[in-house]
């Protein structure tokens, strides 16, 4: 049952070479194991709310309580970590908001670049200056939570110094981490202060602690590893984009749609239009026109630029993205002001995210 009548046909088909699509991450809720977590579904005017975890329906059980717009998880465990979504079903439409839950002691994150030669991490001390262990490069330790696809290689680093030169050992979930604890073992590169695990599997999930010590003291740092088994998902659009805009007659304006998709997406910019003086077809559905779509002759499909706008250009602009898995769309409004009024970026946005995973 199509929800609109297209003035120009649309298909699933992406026609242009891919670019690198990326978005900001969904909101993350962190809880320590054993804690209770309560999340409110941030959607308005919901007649019925349904919840999913990792794309699968979530129902109440002895630890999961669903009351109205609230999801409560009692006595959280690492298994509760994942991508959650609440969908608000209304009489005329539905909307989805998604968020991450991480049940872990770790709370910060950063980048995870490869070692070069690692020489900067191996600090030699003047033999007279006795010193307890200390971290030499905390920037490389900021990313505590590592969510890694299965089969990837993981590297945890604890660059340290001290005099005498400290030793490093690793714990998994608070206990000595032995080679036989995982198939294929692991590598410790002492001069890089690193632990390397190749081809990670779900059983590698857990807390990894480096303990760096010498006769003058001991310091430690814990990383949390989550091994993610994923299925391909439909496009996700960055919340808040495209954003409402206003300009004067004759002005220029740009709408931006930021896309994440792990299958090549097809992007369309669509606007409500009139046909034969009517905004709606005989079936009662609105007429829509495809203004731009990703294709061979279309550069940077994530941006819709309008030049020398007229009052007729005012209205709702829809960014619709599809891949072979599914679709997502969000919209924004363009207000065209008379020449004497100064334009301004509108504060409120009416973008309504439509994504699941």
């Amino acid at each position: 049952r199509p929800s609109f009548s297209l003035v120009e046909d649309t298909t699933l088909e992406p026609e242009e070479p891919p670019t690198k699509y990326q978005i900001s991450q969904p909101e993350v809720y962190v809880a320590a194991p054993g804690e209770s977590l309560e999340v409110r579904c941030l959607l308005k005017d919901a007649a019925v709310i349904s919840w999913t975890k990792d794309g699968v329906h979530l129902g109440p059980n002895n630890r999961t309580v669903l009351i109205g717009e609230y999801l409560q998880i009692k006595g959280a465990t690492p298994r509760d970590s994942g991508l959650y979504a609440c969908t608000a079903s209304r009489t005329v439409d539905s909307e989805t908001w998604y968020f991450m839950v991480n049940v872990t002691d770790a709370i910060s994150s950063g980048d995870d670049e490869d070692d070069t030669d690692g020489a900067e991490d191996f600090v030699s001390e003047n033999s007279n200056n006795k010193r307890a262990p200390y971290w030499t490069n905390t920037e490389k330790m900021e990313k505590r939570l590592h969510a890694v696809p299965a089969a990837n290689t993981v590297k945890f680093r604890c660059p340290a110094g001290g005099n005498p030169m400290p030793t490093m050992r690793w714990l998994k979930n608070g206990k000595e981490f032995k080679q036989e604890h995982r198939i294929g073992g692991y590598k410790v590169r002492n001069q890089h202060w690193s632990l390397i695990m190749e081809s990670v599997v779900p059983s590698d999930k857990g807390n990894y602690t480096c303990v760096v010590e010498n006769e003058y003291g001991s310091i430690n740092h814990t990383y949390h590893l989550d091994v993610v088994e994923r299925s391909p998902h439909r496009p996700i659009l960055q919340a808040g984009l495209p954003a409402n805009a206003s300009t004067v007659v004759g002005g220029d304006v740009e709408f931006v749609c930021k896309v994440y998709s792990d299958a090549q997406p097809h992007i369309q910019w669509i606007k409500h239009v009139e046909k034969n003086g009517s905004k709606y077809g005989p079936d009662g559905l609105p007429y829509l026109k495809v203004l731009k779509h990703s294709g061979i002759n279309s550069s940077n499909a994530e941006v819709l630029a309008l030049f020398n706008v007229t009052e007729a250009d005012a209205g709702e602009y829809i960014c619709k993205v599809s891949n072979y898995i599914g679709q997502a769309n969000q919209s924004a409004w363009l207000t065209v002001l008379p020449k004497q009024q100064a334009p301004g970026r509108e504060k409120e946005i009416t973008a309504s995210p439509d994504y699941l995973e």
Epitope: L12, P18, G55, H57, R234, S322, I325, G326, Q327
Partner: antibody
Framework: QVQLVQSGAEVKKPGASVKVSCKAS????????IHWVKQAPGQGLEWMGA????????SYNQRFKVRATLTADTSTSTVYMELSSLRSEDTAVYYC??????WGQGTTVTVSS | DIQMTQSPSSLSASVGDRVTITCGAS??????LNWYQQKPGKAPKLLIY???NLADGVPSRFSGSGSGTDYTLTISSLQPEDVATYYC?????????FGGGTKVEIK
Amino acid sequence: QVQLVQSGAEVKKPGASVKVSCKASGYIFRNYYIHWVKQAPGQGLEWMGAIYPDNGDTSYNQRFKVRATLTADTSTSTVYMELSSLRSEDTAVYYCARAFTYWGQGTTVTVSS
Amino acid sequence: DIQMTQSPSSLSASVGDRVTITCGASENIYGALNWYQQKPGKAPKLLIYGATNLADGVPSRFSGSGSGTDYTLTISSLQPEDVATYYCQNVLSTPYTFGGGTKVEIK
């Protein structure tokens, strides 16, 4: 868990139509394309088309566009594939699949006079 | 339409062998390629998506590689339960064409 359950086997005469159903459960039905794939006896796989239940958007393989019709009923989380003007070469197993990740068990359609 | 050419059409190997199946596309598909395993009388099962990503629940002995027009599915150590027909599929553009299939048997 995600499940796609298809309707049972059909035997049809040439020129008739057949309507195969695919009932989805365990996920938000409207959020994924449902694809249909044909597999003739002893042959490979052939994509027929897809439908997006949320808005009814469809896309067809040109080879099937004239005779195949895909529809979705969001109230029952069911997708239908109707094939008209049947001929003997339509004898095949027809699969529905949620974004090619989860597949139905297949429906055998036999066209014979 | 994008044509997908698989080779070999069939192969026989011993348990523990490394098995390689190749798939060629008639034009650049930018890594938009899936691999499936189909056992007799059963529906296809997704093994690899996006040319290199292992689907949920698939043993790590399966791996995918390639880019542009040339792609490979590798089974690092063939197991008896891997006897099946394997298909590649273009998921860049419609129609989402499949390769002709590779039948894998145990010697």
